[in-house]
């Protein structure tokens, strides 16, 4: 529990006062306000919302609220030259065209500036050719096609269903396979839950609904033209040919009505197994090309989107700390949306707004947090986490010296079943302790704690009686803070039941149908799940900013390091002969993990009984805790991914959304049996074991007694 140290606090100004001030009705009101028009990054509407949030945060009582602007590369469809896909006959005539826009939802027919579905940063082009169906376009799907089925995608247009992995990885995989275009579509198997109606009568995706999204492979670079540095007024910008992460082939998304028209004619090979079949009434033939009667027909893409350097605006609010103003706890979430942003991001932004209001209320009553709290409304998250990354690049020296923690606040809900938390192991105990103090909003758990309902519905696969907490991956604004800068990070939201709902994300993700009504009618009419998420996110920020000793437990890192070392060793041991031939040993890594475990245990003992009234010793111990996450950063970064610098965690090279442990070793081992030069490949495995072992040992030593 947080203590009421002498920071102008009266007994009522504790965590309870902060939590009691959070109101579901306010979150509902804020969500409505934020979702009435589109707030696409780089548009006037989103600039106006930034100024509104700035004004309201000032009213709520923050010490300062500033706009931080950057000029970054964004991507938009051509308003006079729409993007679409055709089926053309042998004479080149278009006999079928995909739709140019989504039918607007009821009540929104007259809203202007709804951006039509597009794949942001697609290059222009009009490729035509035979279609190949590539399932989810995952690495393993292309292995199946190329290695097992001997199907060559070179010079073909591929069609892939959304889901399972980040869309940018799909496009990268298609490019590597030699495809000349990519069509992405939402299959009902992944975006239509059985027994639920489609919007506006339920929360399922209608046939005309389409998922927008960027298709970059930035690997943490931020603005593609200014990797590593802020896109400010004196920035040096790369030429577009040298830009980071841009796709090289045209890409376009469609809904399942249009996909049906393309897939129903597919010929060639049958699907290899049932995992390649979706729920449409089509054969899911792989191709290449159309079946007999239609074999002379081809698919043609018409993509005319443009990339433009455009100004974006972050809102940065500060609540100065009373005791340690040079220690920053950050709560950030994005503001830009693809269209209305009913869930993504405004269900998160509304929660941040209410958290700011509650903190502001306490501040107006004379309270201050021990440490400084920074609040951020990020811009251009949907275009590659650009706002957060540029701000972190601009402030990297301050952040690496002063950053205590970052709590992310994108969508508060992706379902209404149970809590979902991804965070650094340093925060496990904080999350456990906090959720034990909060009431569960779930039906059937009245009077029970959030911890109890969460543990029951989402149990840890390793530890009985504890809830599942996942690794941080990417695909959201914590990326630069955690993966690049090594600032302890976490995120929390309400999620679906993954066991019974196998669809990817939520069905209306990034479509025009993600409205206020979607949330208010179908997901959270009482806004009780939003309130719970506000309590979790806000409670974490409160504790991180206010507890005398930072609420980090380094022993939990020791536990996971052992688990991750065991896991990567077992992957390597699938190749026992090569490990022997090339003298591959994990002894150094296991030794480092053992040392870390012993040193962390001793540090925790010292943490229990040091003199907390001595400000120098207190600061010293807290700094060791704060800098532990930083100690896992390798300044050289991961191979070919210089902005992913965390040695223990990185976004998976095959799915940006997922986290991978010991990513350097994992990637060195991946598909190693196909590397043309095994000696070189196993040499890289050995090098990565060395880097990991050194890093764990070096991190352990930061927890040793300082003298």
């Amino acid at each position: 529990k947080s203590s009421n140290e002498a920071t102008n606090i009266t007994p009522k100004h504790n965590m309870k006062a902060f939590l009691d001030e959070l109101k579901a009705e306010n979150i509902k009101k804020f969500l409505y306000n934020f979702t009435q028009i589109p707030h696409l990054a780089g548009t006037e509407q989103n600039f106006q919302l930034a100024k509104q949030i700035q004004s309201q945060w000032k009213e709520f009582g923050l010490d300062s609220v500033e706009l931080a602007h950057y000029d970054v590369l964004l991507s938009y469809p051509n308003k006079t030259h729409p993007n679409y896909i055709s089926i053309i006959n042998e004479d080149g005539n278009e006999i079928f065209n995909t739709s140019l826009f989504e039918p607007p939802p009821p009540g929104y027919e007259n809203v202007s500036d709804i951006v039509p579905p597009f794949s942001a940063f697609s290059p222009q082009g009009m490729p035509e050719g035979d279609l190949v169906y590539v399932n989810y376009a995952r690495t393993e799907d292309f292995f199946k096609l190329e290695r097992d089925m001997k199907i060559n995608c070179s010079g073909k247009i591929v069609i892939a269903r959304y889901g399972k992995v980040f869309r940018g990885n799909k496009v990268k995989n298609a490019q590597l396979a030699g495809a000349k275009g990519v069509i992405l579509y939402s299959d009902p198997a992944d975006y239509f839950a059985p027994g639920v109606k489609s919007y506006p009568d339920g929360w399922n995706l209608p046939g005309g609904g389409v998922q927008r999204g960027n298709i970059l492979n930035l690997n943490g670079a931020g603005d593609p033209l200014t990797p590593g540095y802020p896109a400010n007024e004196y920035a040096y910008r790369r030429g577009i040919a040298e830009a980071v992460g841009l796709p090289s082939i045209p890409v376009h998304p469609i809904g399942y009505y249009d996909a049906q028209k393309l897939l129903e004619k597919m010929g060639g090979s049958a699907p290899p197994d049932s995992s390649w079949r979706g729920s449409l009434k089509v054969p899911y033939n792989v191709g290449p090309g159309f079946t007999g009667n239609f074999s002379t027909q081809k698919v043609k893409m018409h993509i005319h989107s443009t990339n433009e350097v455009t100004r974006i605006y972050n809102v940065i609010g500060t609540l100065r700390g009373a005791v340690e103003p040079d220690r920053y706890v950050i709560l950030g979430g994005h503001r830009d949306s693809w269209v209305f942003g009913g869930i993504d991001p405004q269900s998160g932004a509304a929660v941040v707004h209410e958290i700011v209001r509650s903190f502001g209320t306490l501040k107006k009553e004379g309270w201050r947090p021990r440490r400084t709290i920074l609040f951020a409304s990020w811009d251009a998250e949907e275009f590659g986490l650009l706002g957060s990354t540029e701000w972190a690049e601009e402030n990297s020296r301050l952040l690496q010296e002063r950053g205590v923690a970052y709590i992310n606040a994108d969508s508060s809900i992706e379902g209404n079943y149970t809590l979902r938390v991804d965070c650094t192991p340093l925060m496990y105990s904080l999350v456990h302790n906090l959720t034990k103090e909060l009431k569960s909003p779930d039906e059937g758990f009245e009077g029970k704690s959030l911890y109890e309902s969460w543990t029951k519905k989402s149990p840890s696969p390793e530890f009985s009686g504890m809830p599942r907490i996942s690794k941080l991956g990417s695909g959201n604004d914590f990326e630069v803070f955690f993966q690049r800068l090594g600032i302890a990070s976490g995120r929390a939201r309400y999620t679906k039941n993954w066991e019974t709902n196998k669809f990817s994300g939520y069905p209306l993700y990034h479509s025009v149908y993600e409205t206020y009504e979607l949330v208010e009618k179908f997901y959270d009419p009482m806004f009780k799940y939003h309130l719970t998420v506000a309590q979790v996110r806000g409670g974490m920020v409160f504790e991180l900013a206010n507890s005398i000793v930072l609420p980090f437990d380094c022993r939990d890192y020791a536990v996971v390091l052992r688990k991750y070392a065991d896991k990567i060793y077992s992957i390597s041991m699938k190749h026992p002969q090569e490990m022997k031939t090339y003298s591959v040993s994990f002894d150094s890594l296991f030794s480092a993990v053992k040392n870390f475990t012993e040193i962390a245990s001793k540090f925790s003992e010292r943490l229990q009984d040091f003199d907390k009234s001595n400000p120098i010793v207190l600061r010293m111990m807290n700094d060791q805790l704060m800098f532990l996450e930083r100690a896992f950063i390798d300044p050289l970064g991961l191979p070919d991914r210089p902005f992913y610098r965390h040695v223990i965690y990185a976004p998976s090279s095959h799915n940006k959304y997922a986290g991978e442990s010991f990513p350097g070793i994992y990637d060195a081992l991946f598909d190693i049996e196909s590397k043309v030069d095994p000696s070189k490949a196993w040499g890289e495995v050995k090098r990565q074991i060395y880097v990991a072992a050194f890093t764990v040992q070096a991190a352990a030593e930061t927890l040793s007694e300082v003298a």
Epitope: E578, K580, E673, S674, K675, D677, P678, S679, K680, G683
Partner: antibody, heavy 116, light 107 residues
Framework: SVKLQESGPGLVAPSQSLSITCTVS????????VSWIRQPPGKGLEWLGV???????YYNSPLKSRLSINKDNSKSQVFLKMNSLQTDDSAMYYC??????????WGQGTSVTVSS | TVLTQSPAIMSASPGEKVTMTCRAS???????LHWYQQKSSASPKLWIY???NLASGVPARFSGSGSGTSYSLTISSLEAEDAATYYC?????????FGAGTKLELK
């Protein structure tokens, strides 16, 4: 296109040493390994050893003490040296590009006869 | 690991289905079992890699299969140009080893 060309002395006296050069084109020795294989007249194939792109070498154990494989990346050349030749070392000697654990392109071979 | 090929010599008529086998003295990963074709006074050519993958230019009448210690090469319909010696090769640690070969002759 990928090519490998062996060049050797043809005739070697017993107890003398053998040096063969393999000159490659169409690929880089910094990316691929090269193996040496020999085939005595009318017999099967025997793998001698490999030099990988990182310079690591592995040899067939019974021959290890007599064999050495080196390379010059800049000249795209790989060198086989074999000491203390006996008549049963007479064979066609091939170099081959080594990909994973296959030899996917082979030279045309150079014939070596050990005789006084 | 010792590879034993059988038969050592076989003859078959054009159009016939032909199968030759390669047995390993200990288990070999299917990723590391390959076949080569050698015609008289020519260099060997990679013919089938990773048990079942045809090398570039190899006719589709050839196929490979197997796992563990037993592998085979099959020609669905023999043609005159297929007359050659076929060697299997494995890796399960150095040294790489070849079978003694199966010589395929035309009747």
């Amino acid at each position: 296109s990928v090519k490998l060309q062996e060049s050797g002395p043809g005739l070697v006296a017993p107890s003398q040493s053998l040096s063969i050069t393999c000159t490659v084109s169409g690929f880089s020795l910094t990316d691929y390994g090269v193996s040496w294989i020999r085939q005595p007249p009318g017999k099967g194939l025997e793998w001698l050893g490999v030099i990988w792109s990182d310079g690591n070498t592995y040899y067939n154990s019974p021959l290890k003490s007599r064999l050495s494989i080196n390379k010059d990346n800049s000249k795209s050349q790989v060198f086989l040296k074999m000491n203390s030749l006996q008549t049963d070392d007479s064979a066609m000697y091939y170099c081959a590009r080594h990909k994973v654990y296959t030899m996917d392109y082979w030279g045309q071979g150079t014939s070596v006869t050990v005789s006084s | 690991t010792v590879l034993t090929q059988s038969p050592a010599i076989m003859s078959a008529s054009p159009g016939e289905k032909v199968t030759m086998t390669c047995r390993a003295s200990s288990s070999v990963s299917s990723s590391y079992l390959h076949w080569y074709q050698q015609k008289s006074s020519a260099s060997p050519k990679l013919w089938i890699y990773r048990t079942s993958n045809l090398a570039s230019g190899v006719p589709a009448r050839f196929s490979g299969s197997g796992s563990g210690t037993s592998y085979s090469l099959t020609i669905s319909s023999l043609e005159a140009e297929d007359a050659a010696t076929y060697y299997c090769q494995q890796y399960s640690g150095y040294p790489l080893t070849f079978g003694a070969g199966t010589k395929l002759e035309l009747k």
